[in-house]
Amino acid sequence: AESCTSRPHITVVEGEPFYLKHCSCSLAHEIETTTKSWYKSSGSQEHVELNPRSSSRIALHDCVLEFWPVELNDTGSYFFQMKNYTQKWKLNVIRRNKHSCFTERQVTSKIVEVKKFFQITCENSYYQTLVNSTSLYKNCKKLLLENNKNPTIKKNAEFEDQGYYSCVHFLHHNGKLFNITKTFNITIVEDRSNIVPVLLGPKLNHVAVELGKNVRLNCSALLNEEDVIYWMFGEENGSDPNIHEEKEMRIMTPEGKWHASKVLRIENIGESNLNVLYNCTVASTGGTDTKSFILVRKADMADIPGHVFTR
């Protein structure tokens, strides 16, 4: 079953068949005897009841108000009323572009990554029984495809696939020919798949410390939204009351990735904290990356080359 028209604001193109379906449809079937009314308001005309006599272009069926076709003067507010249920839509009918096979304002944009699966299927479930044939156009040039009932493109996207694809359904109603156009603006972009998360800075860090003092070890990474960053140390994390994993700070980058940092705070440094590995790991579906910190007493730092020190 075609789902109801839940969007309160709708824009359509003049000259095409169009329908509004209210959202208490299954309820309406149950109470056949209940009075169901459709109204229109526009300009000075408030709440004018609609019926097939209002216009030869309007048809009413159960849950649906149909336009054969919709025209510019159909712009306005529409109401469905049944008992204490009311649904309202604001309809804006725009001019058809006479110089193109589609109207720019009625285009759905889609971004497809190069080499990823790309599909366009021309379907219209509401009008399907009335559709005689359907054609698919790319940039207003007809594509020769085998199936003229539901033309379909299924392929791995290439940059040449970019363009405007218009599905045009041709249908008959009461001896007249109508068409319905649905256009997609397909943009092919470079692969935007997840980055391999990376920990910033050297993989091994010796940190010069003094016993009894505190130290903060900062671990930063560039990662995807679902990637995680965590510290591992000692036998079992949390066994040392002097070691605290601080809250993660995460900020989104302009590219839609995340910059995350997590600090390990070690208070009142003791002998047991020296010369052991404090590992920071970033994990993603694609694998893990780890960097290590080793606390070294300041007095011992002469044994270690200068370039491995961090503050």
Epitope: K116, Y230, E245, K247, G256, A260
Partner: antibody
Amino acid sequence: EVQLQQSGAELVKPGASVKLSCTTSGFNIKDIYIYWVKQRPEQGLEWVGRIDPANGDTKYGPNFQDKATITADTSSNTAYLQLRSLTSEDTAVYYCARRGNYGAGFGYWGQGTLVTVSA
Amino acid sequence: DIQMTQSPASLSASVGETVTITCRASGNIHNYLAWYQQRQGKSPQILVYNAKTLADGVSSRFSGSGSGTQYSLNINSLQPEDFGTYFCQHFWSTPYTFGGGTKLEIK
């Protein structure tokens, strides 16, 4: 201001399908994942799945692999949840959500869409 | 998949009291945990993210703690507006499952 606006309540028959929408504002939908959560009447919360609108990549919870399809239209900043072969078990409020800007937690939620499956 | 076990399932308390709700994860989730409050007929609202960080605009009467697999939400000096249902949720790896919820009622 970040907002997630969901479509209205749906009353559908068993075996039918329904498509719910979640229109976002205050941010670019391509920059952040959109998640869907199910809550049956007087029950807990269940993670349905998520979409990365930038590339259409989706993940689903174990109970929703064959039940749900999540899509997104970046031109209208809208995410969709389609549910098929509906049964009374699918009667629930469905929420869309996104993370806050700073980490682990859904900082922003839609107002929810009630789907009622009834003959 | 990580499972979250939340306790108690329901709790009665009086205004002014302090209550604690706990969540146990089936594996180490390294503080990737959020707490939410949900009032009747409303969407959940985040209280705490990253296990311990209070979300913007949340009263300091709420606090999150824990590490590894064990986490708690503490509510000090209960106020009438605190009554509702509380959920925890892990963010360690998808699916991001929720705890079963704790219904906090006025005694």
